[in-house]
Structure formats: C-alpha cells, structure tokens
C-alpha cells in the first residue's frame, strides 16, 4: 500500500490529510532524488494521472489542487520525469481521508435481554462520518460514582456482572474522530426496569367437538411474577387483521385461553407479557398455527420441531394497522 | 338447555359494596370464559370483566380496575363479581354472559344495581 | 377504544319489508363483529358472530355482511316479532365494544 513506500522526498496535504468533505484541497510533492533533476512532476489519484490544476513552484515542489474534494478515501502519489530515463520515478504518496466530524450520538437505548448477562446498548450515530469514528460507552454508577468505559463502533454489550455499582446508573457515549467530538445525551437506567423479558412458548391447541369449534391455547412463559398483563393476537391467516384478547394472567395457573372460531380455517397465535409494574414487553412469541376442523371433532396441534414458517402471511398483512408492537411480525 | 340466573343486586350508597352472583347450568361451566356485561339505563351495553375457565386469567374494564373483582367457583357453578367503591355511573343492569368472549351467546335474565344517596 | 356507531337511532319498516340495519368501526375490525337483538324487557341474545355466521336456532331472514370497518345486519321479511333493539359488537380489541343500539319499529 501507499503506507509502505519508501519516499524519495516529501508529499503533504492542506489542510491535512483527513479534511471536512467539500474542503478545497492542495496536495503537495516534493521531490529529493539524487542524480535527476526533474523535466515534470506528475501527480496519481487512484492510479489515474491529474491533468488539471497542478502547478509547479519551483525546480524540486509541484501542488494539485482540488476545488470540493468529496470522495472519502482517495490513494495519492507523485513521480518525476527524470532526463535519460524510460520510466517515471516514484517520489512519494499518501492515503487522504474526507468525511465530517460526528453528529452527537441520540437515541441511545439500553436494554438487558432476560438470560443474556448483557446490558445493550445502542444509539444513533446520526450522518455518515466516512472516516474511522470510535464510540466510547461511559457508564457511572449513580450510587458509588463509578465509572466505566468501553469501546465500541455502533453498539455495546456490557457485561451485568461487571456492573458491580448497584441498580442505577447513567449511560452516555462519546464519538470522536479526526474532526471532532460529540457526546450523546446521559441515559439513566434501572438495570431491573430495562429487563426485555424472554418469550412466551404455545404449546399446544385443541378444538374441542362442538357446533362452534372452541380452541384452548396452551402456553407457558418464563415470568415468575405473580400478576402478569399479556395480549394474545390471532388471526385466521387469510385475513388482515389480527384480534388481539387482553388479560390479567397469575403464574399459579395453566396458562390457557379459549376462542370460539370459524371452522375449516387456519389460524395463527402469538403471545406476550409484560411483568406488573415493568416497562418492557417480551417480544411476541413465534408464531403458532392452528387449524379448526371441518365438521365437529377435535384437533390437536403441537409446535413442529423446526420453527414454524408461514409462507401465506406477507408484510401487507400489516397494512393500515397498528399493534403497540409489531416488531416481531410475520412478514 | 343452558340457563344463568344473576343474583345480588340492589340499592346502594355510593362508596359501597355489593357482589353479584350468577349460577350456571345447562353446559359445563368449567370450561367456558365467562363474563359480566352491564346495561346502562340509556341502553348502552359494556362488557365489565372476563374470567378464563380455570380461573387463572381476568380482564377488568379500566373503569372499574381495582374496584370490581370477578371470579368463579367451579364446583358450584358460579361466577362472581365483587364490586366495591361503587360510583353512580355504575348504576345498571349487570348480566351474567357465556362464553365471555369473544361474542355472548347466553345471557341471564339480569340483576339492577342502583348507586344512589 | 373502538367506536362502534349505529347511525340510526330509530328505523321503522312494515311486516314483509326488508330492512338493514348499519354500525360502522372507527377503525379496522376485520370480520370481528357480532349482532345481538334485544326484545323489550328481555335479554340481549346473539344473532351473527364473525359478521355473518348465524347462532344456533337464528332463523335465515337474518344475515349479516361486511368487512373492515362497515358492517350491516340484514332482516328479510320482516316479521311482527322482530320488534326490537339491535346491537353490534367487535371482538378484535380491547375494550369489547358495542353500538349504541338502533330500535326497530314495525309500522
């Protein structure tokens, strides 16, 4: 690469040689060979050879210049027409940069995922900076005063067990590159309000024999909190929309619902909880299908083996219709 | 045939409590939601609180959250609705109703709740 | 919650008319819905569930149609008996909700 080469003089950028995209740029050669004195200086970007906008200052130094320079990377060298000699003759070459200094980081969201022993947290970078940008996660406890970094490029997965300094801490990163720094609003977090619970699991459905096929949902969930608000949507899978049932469920309990419906149809359920008193919703379960007989007997469904995949449900199922989360739907 | 008799109504102060009972028979009631449906004296109906068969799951309207409680007794086929703090605006006809969701295709004869100084 | 408007308050028709009878869903409902009809001084009692399957002893005059947001409860033949409240209902969110009711008088 151009790191490598080994110069016989001297290249230099201005203003640098990572700049603000946009910026005018001059890129300076000056050569240092010995037993040459140079007809020409000719200047490469990117292999191609600059017709335009270089100016030679004197017998050893020559400058391209570059009105708006807007590409993020560009590979630059420049070589001498020495008399007698077939070849030009490698002077020297840089790597430039162009890109912009980082928007403060927003957005920032941390959140544990039930098992993962991982607080996450992510945010948004904001513009394309088009040059190396590095983000450093700060954590402070707001209880011992402690504070942590980690390094990161776009999110973070901070160890719970290296969170030794109580429940409660603010969170906030920084993004620094060549051309500036930024700092993203603090976060205060409660490591027991950000727990994003795991799913719940269908387990099985029956349709029981009767005029109006009654279907029970077995499902089961890994919330251990007694009281517990959960929605359960389903919908038969040629239609649009979903019906969602609410309920106050207690974990002492099979977890069980019923649903009168049409017959001869197929149907798909899903699942989620929220703990008493938390923020955070499990994601849906996945989804469960369900058919309702024909004529009156009963029909038994179990979850395959391999996760079930709906190939009649499209992303237009969602349209013109909202759930508080539709973050896991069938699509 | 299936038959729900509502019981337990009556004339009471705002502030105070009544439970309203509802005996089944006539389709296994252990097996079946089972809901309180009120009517208004306007006519409107509202659907007040569901109970899964076994118990385990309830759906209270936000009105009456934390004042209201339904529940059931399934070896005596009967479904309950304790109701406390009650306001004027709870005055109505409250109905027993099978299944209790996600349509009532039985409904009993009814049971008046007045809230009244 | 879901608003469930019955437009008309009142509707008067004649023994052997057909009449229909319209609720309309503030948002989607699907094909979530159900009609009761409520006799005076007697219970509601379920005619259509799933907007157009009839309950068990319905007699066929009664039908039901639509989808989404616009439902309608048909009588054909309207008969003496039919004197009545009418009352829709959706079962696709919570709070269950239910029309304001629409009287039918026979002439």
């Known amino acids: 690469g151009i790191a490598t080469i080994n110069c016989s003089g001297n290249m230099w950028v201005e203003p640098g040689e990572i700049f603000q995209m946009g910026m005018n740029v001059s890129v300076y050669c000056q050569e240092a060979l010995k037993n040459c004195r140079p007809r020409n200086l000719h200047f490469y970007k990117n292999g191609f050879k600059e017709r335009f906008h270089i100016t030679r200052i004197n017998r050893t130094t020559a400058r391209v210049w570059y009105k708006g320079f807007s590409e993020p990377h560009a590979s630059m060298y420049c070589t001498a027409e020495c008399p007698g000699r077939f070849q030009e003759t490698l002077i020297c070459g840089k790597d430039i940069s162009s890109g912009y200094p980082p928007d403060a980081p927003s957005n920032m969201t941390c959140v544990i995922y039930e098992y993962s022993g991982n607080m996450t947290c992510t945010w948004n970078t904001g513009k394309p900076t088009y040059i190396d940008t590095k983000y450093t996660v700060h954590v402070k406890s707001l209880e011992t005063e402690e504070q942590q970094q980690y390094l990161a490029s776009n999110y973070v997965n901070i160890s719970t067990d290296s969170l030794q300094g109580g429940r409660k801490y603010l969170v906030w990163v920084q993004a620094v590159n060549a051309l500036g720094m930024e700092n993203s609003q603090q976060l205060q977090v409660h490591l027991d309000d950000i727990v994003i619970p795991s799913p719940s699991i269908i387990s099985r459905a029956e349709t029981t024999n009767a005029n109006v096929p009654k279907t029970i949902i077995y499902w089961k969930s890994k919330i251990m909190t007694g009281k517990v608000f959960c929605e359960m949507r389903y919908k038969a899978t040629t239609n649009q929309t979903w019906n969602v049932k609410e309920f106050d469920t207690n974990y002492t309990y099979v977890q069980q619902s019923e649903f009168y419906l049409e017959p001869n149809s197929k149907y798909v359920f899903q699942v989620r909880c929220q703990g008493t008193g938390k923020r955070n919703w499990q994601p849906w379960s996945s989804p469960f299908v369900h058919q309702t007989p024909q004529t009156a007997s009963q029909v038994t469904s179990k979850p395959p083996h391999e996760p079930q995949k709906i190939e009649m449900l499209t992303a237009t199922i969602f349209k013109g219709h909202s759930t508080s989360d539709n973050s896991q739907d069938i699509g | 045939e299936v038959k729900l008799v509502e019981s337990g109504g009556g004339l009471v102060q705002p502030g105070g409590s009544l439970k309203l009972s509802c005996a089944a028979s006539?389709?296994?009631?252990?097996?079946?939601?089972m809901s309180w449906v009120r009517q208004t004296p306007e006519k409107r109906l509202e659907l007040v609180a569901e109970i899964s068969s076994n118990g385990g799951s309830t759906y209270h309207i936000d009105t009456v959250k934390g004042r209201f409680t339904i529940s059931r007794d399934n070896a005596k086929n009967t479904l309950y609705l304790q109701m406390s703090s009650l306001k004027s605006e709870d005055t109505a006809m409250y109905y027993c109703?099978?299944?209790?969701?996600?349509?009532?295709?039985?409904w009993g004869q009814g049971t008046t709740v007045t809230v009244s100084a | 919650d879901i608003v469930m408007t019955q437009s008309h308050r009142f509707m008067s028709t004649s023994v052997g008319e057909r009449v229909s009878i319209t609720c309309k869903a503030s948002q989607d409902v699907g094909n979530a819905v159900a009609w009761y009809q409520q006799k005076p001084g007697q219970s509601p009692k379920l005619l259509i569930y799933?907007?157009?399957t009839r309950h068990n002893g319905v007699p066929d005059r009664f039908t039901g149609s639509g989808s989404g947001t616009d439902f309608t409860l048909t009588i054909s033949n309207v008969q003496g008996e039919d004197l009545a409240d009418y009352f829709c209902q959706q079962y696709n969110r919570y709070p269950l909700t239910f029309g304001s009711g629409t009287k039918l008088e026979i002439k």
């Open positions: 109703a099978s299944p209790g969701y996600p349509w009532f295709a039985y």
């Open positions: 799933w907007t157009s």
């Open positions: 006539g389709f296994t009631f252990s097996s079946d939601t």
